[in-house]
Interface confidence: low
């Protein structure tokens, strides 16, 4: 006859491990007893349990309440046992020794693997700002046994680097995602994906990227110079920029205070009916927590009585 067992039995932490040991004998052979022991290298043998064909199951004190026979119906040639509620410390080598009549004794070994599923954590890096070089966007850490796999799922271009720390019975894996921040990354998801044989499916943690930036400012409203003439109503200048966080706008006049009747409404400067007093250099100041920008324009209000053409300068400065 011979013993049938498994080379490796794998269970998830907290679940029950079936340690298989079946004697495949010839007709008429009987199993007298099955002894189970833990036999890790260099630590000697530690008895788990003894299954006796006549006296039943005896469990050693160290495993009291944790070793049981599989539920009925049972085959008298089956020496398998259940190790309840597996913990990491149960991982190791086990041996079953079967005493048969009349064929004698047989023994077989198996290895018990206890999978410890990871609980991943994602930590965002420092604040991302446009213009920075390669910057840490986020790091993701997962600890388990065996070591989990940590990868990234994102449309964003970047580089990853991983490192692992081995503990006595588990391993922690940390993966970092670095990128060169740009405004196009705003709102893009960066997902840490953790794979592990003890997980039903990959675990995913998503971080939404926020990149601070401020675009160059420009002023609209002077495209048709002939419209800026004395008496015109509804004339306005609009400051164009965008940023994250959203910017605030402020208007000033470089060559004096804003004329009376000129209304500031955020990014828009509204004029009363135009007079020559409204000629001048106007500056739009755009700022957010990240940066500030200026754009200035020269307004020259035409007198229809005069024949001269209006001059318009547009100058942008950072």
């Amino acid at each position: 006859g011979e013993l049938e067992t498994s080379d490796v039995v794998t269970v998830v932490l907290g679940q029950d491990a079936k340690l298989p040991c079946f004697y495949r004998g010839d007709s008429g052979e009987q199993v007298g007893q099955v002894a189970w022991a833990r036999v890790d290298a260099g630590e000697g043998a530690q008895e788990l349990a003894l299954l006796h064909s006549k006296y039943g199951l005896h469990v050693s004190p160290a495993y009291e309440g944790r070793v049981e026979q599989p539920p009925p119906p049972r085959n008298p040639l089956d020496g398998s046992v259940l190790l309840r509620n597996a913990v990491q410390a149960d991982e190791g080598e086990y041996e079953c020794r079967v005493s048969t009549f009349p064929a004698g004794s047989f023994q077989a070994r198996l290895r018990l693997r206890v999978l410890v599923p990871p609980l991943p954590s994602l930590n965002p890096g420092p604040a991302l700002e446009e213009g920075q070089g390669l910057t840490l966007a986020a790091s993701c850490t997962a600890e388990g046994s065996p070591a989990p796999s940590v990868t990234w799922d994102t449309e964003v271009k970047g580089t990853t680097s991983s490192r692992s720390f081995k503990h006595s019975r588990s391993a922690a894996v940390t993966s970092e995602f670095h990128l060169v921040p740009s405004r196009s990354m705003n709102g893009q998801p960066l997902t840490c994906v953790v794979s592990h044989p003890g997980l039903l499916q990959d675990q995913r943690i998503t971080h939404i990227l926020h990149v601070s930036f401020l675009a160059e400012a420009s002023v609209r409203g002077l495209e048709d110079q002939n419209l800026w003439h004395i008496g015109r109503e509804g004339a306005m200048l609009k400051c164009l920029s965008e940023g994250q966080p959203p910017p605030s706008y402020n208007w000033t006049r470089l060559d004096g205070p804003l004329p009376s009747g000129v209304r500031v409404d955020g990014d828009t400067l509204g004029f009363p009916p135009l007079t020559t007093e409204h000629s001048g250099i106007y500056v739009c100041h755009v700022s957010n927590e990240f940066s500030s920008r200026d754009s200035q324009v020269t307004v020259d209000v035409l007198d229809p009585q005069e024949d001269s053409g209006k001059q318009v300068d547009l100058v942008s400065a950072s």
């Epitope: 029950d16 539920p71 309840r84």
Partner: antibody
């Protein structure tokens, strides 16, 4: 085919202890959990707790102080005890089976327990 | 505890309609979500587990999708036997159920 069957008194007096039994047939409980879930009349579902094949238990924190779940492996039975009941504990009580994750692939048919004097 | 907000609480539909039910978790539950169908006087029946996996014996007109905090159960073509109440349930920590969606005949 795995089957779960709840049994126990349908009427319990306020302040007393509600006791129910779930009998599992047609399959082993090895590597499974047996959960209790309740549903007040006309309302939604509430998870009460679980006992795993290894004997360990987990309870809903909102009920933990009043709940005990135990088992008798020789009879393939799991019992629920809920102490100091009030009318708010009136519900259909279900037992259900799960693997190592807490979703429930087999359910009992449920038993209505009314708390009233 | 993680709260599960299910919407709508009820809907009327006709046989053949495409029906969508959504469930939002108060925090990321990493696809640890199940969907159940319950008919009056009966126990719930598992339809979908782990957000997208169809349970054994469940017709392919049912499907689950979503990740993070937002999840959806879709019935591609409603059948007469599908009129029931549907519940989502997360199993990331202490399990909690959504409030349910009753699918009625229009």
């Amino acid at each position: 085919q795995v089957q779960l069957q709840e049994s126990g008194p349908g009427l319990v007096k306020p302040s007393e202890t509600l006791s129910l039994t779930c009998t599992v047939s047609g399959g082993s409980l090895t590597n499974y959990g047996v959960h209790w879930v309740r549903q007040p009349p006309g309302k939604g579902l509430e998870w009460i707790g679980v006992i795993w094949s290894g004997g360990s238990t987990n309870y809903n924190p909102s009920l933990k102080s009043r709940v005990t779940i135990s088992r008798d492996t020789s009879k393939n039975q799991v019992s629920l005890k809920l102490s100091s009941v009030t009318a708010a504990d009136t519900a259909v009580y279900y037992c259900a089976r799960s693997g190592k994750w807490y979703y429930f692939d087999y359910w009992g048919q449920g038993t209505l327990v009314t708390v009233s004097s | 505890d993680i709260q599960m907000t299910q919407s709508p609480s009820s809907l009327s539909a006709s046989v053949g309609d495409r029906v969508t039910i959504t469930c939002r978790a108060s925090e990321n539950i990493y696809s640890n979500l199940a969907w159940y169908q319950q008919k009056p006087g009966k126990a719930p029946k598992l339809l979908v587990y782990a957000a997208t996996n169809l349970a054994d014996g469940v017709p392919s007109r049912f499907s689950g999708s979503g990740s993070g905090t937002d999840y959806t159960l879709t019935i591609s073509s409603l059948q007469p036997e599908d009129f029931a109440t549907y519940y989502c349930q997360h199993f990331w920590g202490t399990p909690t159920f959504g409030g349910g969606t009753k699918v009625e005949i229009k």
